[in-house]
Structures are given as structure tokens and as C-alpha cells.
């Protein structure tokens, strides 16, 4: 079996529902899984009239459709919640919507951190 993966150990973490779910709102997540299984990062978001609302980011369990994806790219046309996954540490920092019908590619950059 050819194995072309970038090992995923850590992902960007975000939870828009952090208060209700009693979690942190954002940060880094260390990925843990069963031995010999691959791990991925993911991002999910909504797009309301061009306004991007992050839903969640974090680690994602072994999923064949995530294998060998270096970038987090969602391809569904107009879902309620956009989803992408990728392999490699913090690969979910940026995420992209590239609709299958050939619409414009839209990449979402994380906001720059404020200078300290």
C-alpha cells in the first residue's frame, strides 16, 4: 500500500458553541487516535450572504476522503454547513470553498493576531 500522508499531530481548535458545550473557544488541539490509524484536521463553517461564520475546527478521525489532502477545501455547492479536512499539522488554519460547478474559489484566512 502506498502511504503518502503527512502525519497530523496537532490542529487549530475552535468551537463557536463553546459556552453551551463547556469547552475552550479556540486554541490548539492535540490529536489522539488508535494506533495505525490516520488523523486529520477539519474546519466547518457557514456562509450567510458572504459573511463567514466559523462553526468548529479541530482533529478529525481516520477518514479516507481526507487522505493526502494538504489543504482544507470544501467542494459542496451550497450546504448548510461547509466542511473540509486535511492532513498535516495546523492544515485547517486556512480553508477554501471550491464549488464543483466551477464557481469562484474563495479562501478564508485567519484574522491576523493583534500585536502584543
Amino acid at each position: 500500500s502506498g502511504r503518502g500522508e503527512a502525519e497530523t499531530r496537532e490542529c487549530i481548535y475552535y468551537n463557536a458553541n463553546w459556552e453551551l458545550e463547556r469547552t475552550n473557544q479556540s486554541g490548539l488541539e492535540r490529536c489522539e487516535g488508535e494506533q495505525d490509524k490516520r488523523l486529520h484536521c477539519y474546519a466547518s463553517w457557514r456562509n450567510s450572504s458572504g459573511t463567514i461564520e466559523l462553526v468548529k475546527k479541530g482533529c478529525w478521525l481516520d477518514d479516507f476522503n481526507c487522505y493526502d489532502r494538504q489543504e482544507c477545501v470544501a467542494t459542496e455547492e451550497n450546504p448548510q454547513v461547509y466542511f473540509c479536512c486535511c492532513e498535516g499539522n495546523f492544515c485547517n488554519e486556512r480553508f477554501t470553498h471550491l464549488p464543483e460547478a466551477g464557481g469562484p474559489e474563495v479562501t478564508y484566512e485567519p484574522p491576523p493576531t493583534a500585536p502584543t
Partner: antibody, heavy 118, light 111 residues
Framework: EVQLLESGGGLVQPGGSLRLSCAAS????????MSWVRQAPGKGLEWVSG????????FYTDSVKGRFTVSRDNSRNTLYLQMNSLRAEDTAVYYC???????????WGQGTLVTVSS | QTVVTQEPSFSVSPGGTVTLTCGFN?????????PSWYQQTPGQAPRTLIY???TRSSGVPDRFSGSILGNKAALTITGAQADDESDYYC??????????FGGGTKLTVLG
């Protein structure tokens, strides 16, 4: 509309070779993992092989390892299964299937029949 | 060698409810195996019914539902209809690039 069209099946003698193709349309092929599943006459479905979006990772069921090779041409939107050293027990309808998140088969082709017989 | 087990055959009366199960020899089936279910009628390609344990594929009527029952994945058909007479297959994702199909259940709708 998603379409998967297999071709390349036929009658082949034991020890012979065949190459199956699966032409994909209606979705961004390069962004989808793919798989082959087969069904022997009167039997159940059996997973055969899978290939990642880039083709960088390939996997096989034990009974075909070293004999079958899965590949893809993302510029031609086509999935392939090269089958060598064919045996009578490889006789089956071979389906290609698109893999979606949560590692399930969301679309299937209509299948192509491979018959291995002398 | 992982073996996924399903009831070889099952019968249900029209309008009745039937639950098909999917287990395996290496322990309990959990949602991390992302069980999925497929329906196949003779001479046809499989049709996707359920994925991610309990999510219906698009166009699948809500008479079909998926769950975990005890240590197995389950497919429940409520209000069975004549055209539900088919073979039903479960698939478990073992991870690391490997899927295993169950042997299938032949469902007969009586009458």
C-alpha cells in the same frame, strides 16, 4: 448529475490480465477518493481497493494484493484497476464507487463483468 | 481477519418493522467505524441508504433509520413496503484504508 461508467470487463483465461476503467463525470473527480467493489455471481459485495484523492495512497483487500493495481488520472477523470494473474475466483461484477466524508460510498457505477475461465 | 456478520435472511409483513444488524468478530461496533448501509436489488448497482451510523443519504425515505444497538450497527425499516424486498449490506470502515462488507441480508416482504 454524478455518473460513474465502468468498462474493460470481459472473458479472460486464468493467469491473464485486464484493465478496468471508470469514467467519472458530474463532480470534481480530483477532489474525491475512489474505490473498487466487486460481487461474484450469486454472492455478496466485497471491497477490493481504494485510492486517495491524489493517488498517493492505495489499499487492497488481501486476496488481490500483488496482483491488482489501482490508479487514477485526474486530468482524464478516470479511475483504473489493472488486474494481473487473474484467477477463477476473481470472476465478478466490478463496481467503481465514489468515496465521501465519513468513509462511505455515496455513488456507484453500474458495474462491468469480469469472467475468468478457460 | 475481520469478519462482519449480518443475518443471512429476514422476513417482514407489509407495514411491519424489521431491524437488521451488523456485528464483527473483533469486538463492538461503534460510531468510529462509521457504519453505512446499502440496498441492492438483483441485477442493479447498490444504492446508498445510511452513512455515519444514522445519517440518511439524499432521497432515502425516513422509513429507513440507522443506529447502534448494543454492540452492533442496526438498520431499521418501519412500515415495510413490497419494494423494500432486496439485499441489504452493511460496511464498516476499519481505518487505514480498509473497508469490510457484511455478508448481506436477504429481506423478504411477505404477502
Amino acid at each position: 448529475e454524478v455518473q460513474l461508467l465502468e468498462s474493460g470487463g470481459g472473458l479472460v483465461q486464468p493467469g491473464g490480465s485486464l484493465r478496468l476503467s471508470c469514467a467519472a463525470s458530474g463532480f470534481t473527480f480530483r477532489n474525491s477518493a475512489m474505490s473498487w467493489v466487486r460481487q461474484a455471481p450469486g454472492k455478496g459485495l466485497e471491497w477490493v481497493s481504494g485510492i486517495s484523492v491524489t493517488g498517493g495512497s492505495t489499499f487492497y483487500t488481501d486476496s488481490v494484493k500483488g496482483r491488482f493495481t489501482v490508479s487514477r488520472d485526474n486530468s482524464r477523470n478516470t479511475l483504473y484497476l489493472q488486474m494481473n494473474s487473474l484467477r477463477a475466483e476473481d470472476t465478478a461484477v466490478y463496481y467503481c464507487a465514489k468515496v465521501y466524508y465519513y468513509s462511505f460510498f455515496d455513488y456507484w457505477g453500474q458495474g462491468t463483468l469480469v469472467t475468468v475461465s478457460s | 481477519q475481520t469478519v462482519v456478520t449480518q443475518e443471512p435472511s429476514f422476513s417482514v409483513s407489509p407495514g411491519g418493522t424489521v431491524t437488521l444488524t451488523c456485528g464483527f468478530n473483533s469486538g463492538s461496533v461503534s460510531t468510529s467505524y462509521w457504519p453505512s448501509w446499502y440496498q441492492q436489488t438483483p441485477g442493479q448497482a447498490p444504492r446508498t441508504l445510511i452513512y455515519n451510523t444514522n445519517t440518511r443519504s439524499s432521497g432515502v425515505p425516513d422509513r429507513f433509520s440507522g443506529s447502534i444497538l448494543g454492540n452492533k450497527a442496526a438498520l431499521t425499516i418501519t412500515g415495510a413496503q413490497a419494494d423494500d424486498e432486496s439485499d441489504y449490506y452493511c460496511v464498516l470502515w476499519m481505518g487505514s484504508g480498509i473497508w469490510v462488507f457484511g455478508g448481506g441480508t436477504k429481506l423478504t416482504v411477505l404477502g
